[in-house]
Interface confidence: low
């Protein structure tokens, strides 16, 4: 997988001296912009959220209903950039916004490094799964989420749902069988109901691989990078991020570690 | 069917204080965000406040703060507007009113709040 | 004096389509939040017709149409209906969970 450089990154995201922090991989071709608007906007192709057809009953947890329980928009934004091996998460590479699902050169390469920041959480090891991590006092540009684990054999979905109480701020959802494809879905659920989604293409996961996951936030979204290649981008859709307190993750995996360090 | 009902509007003097309360019926009441909004006779809505389901994140608009206080009791599935230092600006029909992904979409007929001498 | 920017008035013959506007600024109706439209009949509570900027509720009519164009929202009414005729209200978030509202604008229909 192509990795993304942490450089490029931070010099894109505004960082005074990039060049403070180590790259850990030598120099790949930088990222480019993704074409295609992100949100917001309306997401072309999306299935109007209007009465939700097939969603889950109120206060059902994300992800376990069948798949037509989540209503289907799409366009999917480019994501945040991974990480070093065995450091932290990386950051996002630079270009621009997501691009349409499966467009072309819409997941731009790229390559990375990582920053001495030491994470806080959870110490390696097993942990259960449907597991609730918390993020004190919610989250903040520049806080990188790390979550390793395996992917099930035979897995059907992976879930994180960063929750504002009972709010889903970000749902990422990773599902391995929606009607014959694999498909990242990305949503937001405000005042009980499921927003528009927006779909993936690109599917980094296989069942019983091991996998990371790094989700770096932003001022203005999420970036996410699967085993240290950019995946996806998602805007913010609720604007007060310290009250974005927990990160719930569920679904197929094995899960051996997740923690969040300010990088 | 889902209904809200609001209660406890009345001729109040400028100064004094008032509760106003809102019976909520045929929806899950603590799953969802809510609000008060307001409509002077005559006048456009005005947004007053809103609480999400576990009265944890509460938000108010400029011109009450420190004046009203929403709360809710999911038990007995109630929303409440406590208005104090009322003025005769205040003077308004009060709306409770369910959330729905960015926009209103239950709202009750409403309780009037005279505030005169 | 309200946040968000409406006409007073806009009027239509029954059969045609009005428009109207609802002006705001990158902190509202500009931003990514949602802008929803209301409808109120005199001495009625308001009626959600709109949400999430171009959603319609289930049970209002597809003549009812919203879209957004950068700092301002329009709530489109085609083959206008005599019980059309109403006041009808744009409403922005500017944060989370705060809410403003417009001034309103009277729907006559000729």
């Known amino acids: 997988a192509d990795s993304f450089s942490l450089n490029d990154a931070l010099a894109g995201s505004g960082n005074p001296n990039p060049q403070g922090y180590p790259g850990a991989w030598g120099n790949q071709p930088g990222a480019g912009g993704y074409p295609g608007a992100a949100y917001p906007g309306a997401y072309p192709g999306q299935a109007p959220p209007g009465a939700y057809p097939g969603q889950a009953p109120p206060g059902a947890y994300p992800g376990q209903a069948p798949p037509s329980a989540y209503p289907g928009p799409t366009a999917p934004g480019a994501y945040p950039g991974p990480t070093a091996p065995g450091a932290y998460p990386g950051q996002p590479a630079p270009g621009a916004f997501p691009g349409q699902p499966g467009a072309p050169g819409a997941y731009p390469q790229c390559s990375g490094g990582y920053p001495a920041a030491g994470p806080y959480g959870v110490p390696a090891g097993p942990l259960t799964v449907p597991y609730d991590l918390p993020l004190p006092g919610g989250v903040m540009p520049r806080m990188l989420i790390t979550i390793m684990g395996t992917v099930k054999p035979n897995a059907n979905r992976i879930v994180l749902d960063f929750r504002r109480g009972n709010d889903v701020a970000f749902h990422f959802n990773p599902r391995f069988n929606e009607n014959n494809r694999r498909v990242i879905v990305c949503n937001t659920k405000q005042d009980n109901n499921w927003g528009k989604e927006e779909r993936q293409s690109a599917f980094p996961f296989e069942s019983g691989k091991p996998f990371k996951i790094q989700v770096l936030v932003e001022a203005d979204h999420f970036k996410v990078a699967v085993n240290d290649a950019h995946l996806l981008q998602y805007n913010h859709r609720m604007k007060n991020l310290r009250e974005i307190s927990q990160l719930g993750i569920s679904g197929d995996i094995t899960l051996t570690s997740a923690n969040h360090a300010m990088i | 069917e889902v209904q809200l009902v609001e209660s406890g509007g009345s001729l109040v003097k400028p100064g004094g204080s008032l509760r106003l309360s809102c019976a909520a019926s045929?929806?899950?009441?603590?799953?969802?965000?809510m609000n008060w909004v307001r409509q002077a006779p005559g006048k456009g809505l005005e947004w007053i406040s809103n609480i999400d389901g576990s009265s944890r994140y509460i938000y108010y608009a400029d011109f009450v703060k420190g004046r009203f206080t929403i709360s809710r009791d999911n038990a007995k599935n109630s929303l409440y507007l406590q208005m104090n230092s009322l003025r005769a600006e205040d003077t308004a029909v009060y709306y409770c009113?369910?959330?729905?992904?960015?926009?209103?979409?239950?709202w009750g007929r409403g309780t009037l709040v005279t505030v005169s001498s | 004096q309200s946040v968000l920017t409406q006409p007073a008035s806009v009027s239509g013959s029954p059969g045609q389509s009005i428009t109207i506007s609802c002006a705001g600024t990158?902190?509202?109706?500009?931003?990514?939040?949602?802008v929803a439209w209301y409808q109120q009949h005199p001495g009625k509570a308001p009626k959600l017709m709109i949400y999430?900027?171009?959603y319609r509720p289930s049970g209002v009519s597809n003549r009812f149409s919203g879209s957004k164009s950068g700092n301002t929202a329009s709530l489109t009414i085609s083959g206008l209906q005599a019980e059309d005729e109403a006041d009808y209200y744009c409403?922005?978030?500017?944060?989370?969970?705060?809410?403003?509202f417009g001034g309103g604008t009277k729907l006559e229909i000729k």
């Open positions: 045929g929806f899950t009441f603590s799953n969802y965000n």
């Open positions: 409403s922005s978030s500017t944060g989370y969970s705060t809410r403003v």
């Open positions: 999430y900027d171009s």
């Open positions: 009113v369910r959330s729905y992904y960015g926009g209103m979409d239950v």
């Open positions: 990158s902190s509202d109706v500009g931003g990514y939040y949602n």
